[in-house]
Interface confidence: low
């Protein structure tokens, strides 16, 4: 039935949106010398570009392919840390080891972490009311097909030995309708990348199971191993005591605080 | 409206300091990196420094490295500029200037500009 | 450093005539597919004042008698009907590379 206006599932846009992604463009742009001649303004015509006055179910990766150019980054690929479940410790990390990469430390990815956005059909409104939700209207909308599209460049870009971050906590530890597991797994090059490692984060402070035996981590080396990437997998048990031995790696204590299961 | 007010200028022996404040108002002064900007009696503009919103990256002109200072008090909506070791070619009238919000190095925005002369 | 060279150092053109100033780069500025170069006007006594960004982009508020043009080391700003108000001196600004760096000026008189 026709509606004066689309009433959708999911939240609707993030208020001051555009001020957000541009404020956080020219942040970003001056923490990181390398990226300070991106100009911004264009970033953001890009970026609204990819979904104002586009049906917001109705939106391809091709739609972010001006902003995908202009936000071109190289990032050094052998430092490149996926998460899944777990973005908080993920960026924790990244922040204390400032040599590796989650995609949100790029600037498409912190442009647009925690955000929601989209438009409606042939009106150049935001729509700051509701937003397509993936599960109950749409996969094709413009969030999902952002991250979709970054996650999936990202990807691509890995090498050697490529990290993940993975939720020991959750009944599907690895699950495959997460981004990394529908999206990233799927892009890594073979020919590029040695190995894929994974990390699994334990919650119970007396969880001293291997969660590496876990039936949806075999999946994972499945699924790994079947692309000829090798596979292996750590318990971190204590994610606190983990990142306390990142910022102090010459604690005696650290010595053993990453337990290794390796598979290959 | 924008207002940028340089003040602190004035007559300095060489090798002596001066500290110049650039007042801000009309802006949300933290969302702006800030710059200052000199000229010369008679000549063109010379870009001297740069700092970010959260004062987290600083950029110097080679020539003033290790004697000027850029700072600012997000607080107190305030840019800064201390001078040591005044050398008679730091004579000019110094501009603080508002970076462009969407792109690094240009300016939108110029204070009046404060004159400082370096004589014996 | 890049080395902005402005010419003319002075100009002079009658009311309602063309004034062209060109800016010359020791290198490229451009970068991402956009020209970091911008033009400022400069009144005795006053702050410069921004009137073309990134090449072409007419800041708001400046008339559209001025105009920008160019790519890579080439640059030129145009005022298509030379007025009284736009007696100055003209300045051209790269922000491709640190340090940011002006060109000498080129200053329009009527004449």
């Known amino acids: 039935v026709p509606r004066w206006r689309q009433q959708w599932s999911g939240p609707g846009t993030t208020k001051r949106f555009p001020e957000t992604v541009l404020a956080r463009c020219v942040k970003y742009t001056e923490i990181h010398p390398e990226m300070r001649h991106v100009d911004c303004q264009s970033v953001w015509d890009a970026f609204k570009g990819a979904f104002i006055s586009k049906h917001p179910c109705n939106i391809t990766e091709e739609d972010y392919q001006p902003l995908m150019k202009l936000g071109t980054q190289t990032v050094p690929c052998n430092k490149i840390l996926l998460w899944s479940r777990i973005k908080d410790l993920a960026h924790q990390f990244t922040q204390v080891q400032r040599d590796m990469f989650t995609l949100e430390d790029t600037l498409l990815g912190y442009l647009a972490d925690d955000l929601t956005w989209c438009g409606e059909f042939n009106t150049s409104k935001i729509n700051y009311q509701s937003c397509p939700d993936w599960r109950k209207d749409c996969s094709n909308n413009p969030v999902s097909v952002f991250w979709k599209t970054v996650s999936r460049r990202f990807a691509e870009a890995a090498c050697d030995v490529v990290h993940v971050m993975l939720n020991g906590s959750r009944s599907k530890i690895f699950d495959k309708n997460s981004t990394f597991g529908s999206v990233e797994v799927h892009n890594l090059q073979p020919e590029k990348v040695q190995t894929l490692e994974a990390w699994v984060i334990h919650g119970g402070r007396e969880d001293s199971r291997d969660l590496c035996q876990d039936p949806t981590i075999k999946e994972l080396e499945s699924i790994i191993s079947k692309r000829n990437i090798q596979f292996s997998c750590k318990n971190i048990y204590r994610p606190d005591k983990f990142l306390q031995c990142v910022k102090n790696p010459e604690d005696s204590s650290c010595t053993s605080e990453i337990h290794h299961h390796h598979h290959h | 409206e924008v207002q940028l007010v340089e003040s602190g200028g004035g007559l300095v022996q060489p090798g002596g300091s001066l500290r110049l404040s650039c007042a801000a108002s009309?802006?949300?002064?933290?969302?702006?990196?800030m710059h200052w900007v000199r000229q010369a009696p008679g000549k063109g503009l010379e870009w001297i420094a740069f700092i970010s919103t959260g004062s987290s990256n600083i950029y110097y002109v080679d020539k003033v490295k290790g004697r000027f200072t850029i700072s600012r008090d997000n607080a107190k909506n305030t840019l800064y500029l201390q001078m040591t070791s005044l050398r008679a070619e730091d004579t000019a009238v110094y501009y603080c200037?508002?970076?462009?919000?969407?792109?690094?190095?240009?300016?939108?925005?110029w204070g009046q500009g404060t004159t400082v002369t370096v004589s014996s | 450093d890049i080395v902005l060279t402005q010419s003319p150092a002075s100009l002079a053109v009658s009311l309602g005539e063309r004034a062209t100033i060109n800016c010359r780069a020791s290198e490229s500025v451009d970068n991402y597919g956009i020209s970091f170069m911008h033009w400022y006007q400069q009144k005795p006594g006053q702050p410069p004042k921004l009137l073309i960004y990134?090449?072409?982009n007419l800041e708001s508020g400046v008339p559209a008698r001025f105009s920008g043009s160019g790519s890579r080391t080439d640059f030129t700003l145009t005022i298509s009907s030379l007025q009284a108000e736009d007696v100055a001196v003209y300045y051209c600004?790269?922000?491709?590379?640190?340090?940011?760096?002006f060109g000498g000026g080129t200053k329009v008189e009527i004449k």
């Open positions: 200037a508002r970076n462009y919000v969407s792109s690094y190095g240009y300016f939108d925005y």
């Open positions: 990134r090449a072409s």
């Open positions: 009309g802006f949300t002064f933290s969302d702006y990196g």
């Open positions: 600004q790269q922000t491709n590379k640190d340090p940011l760096t």
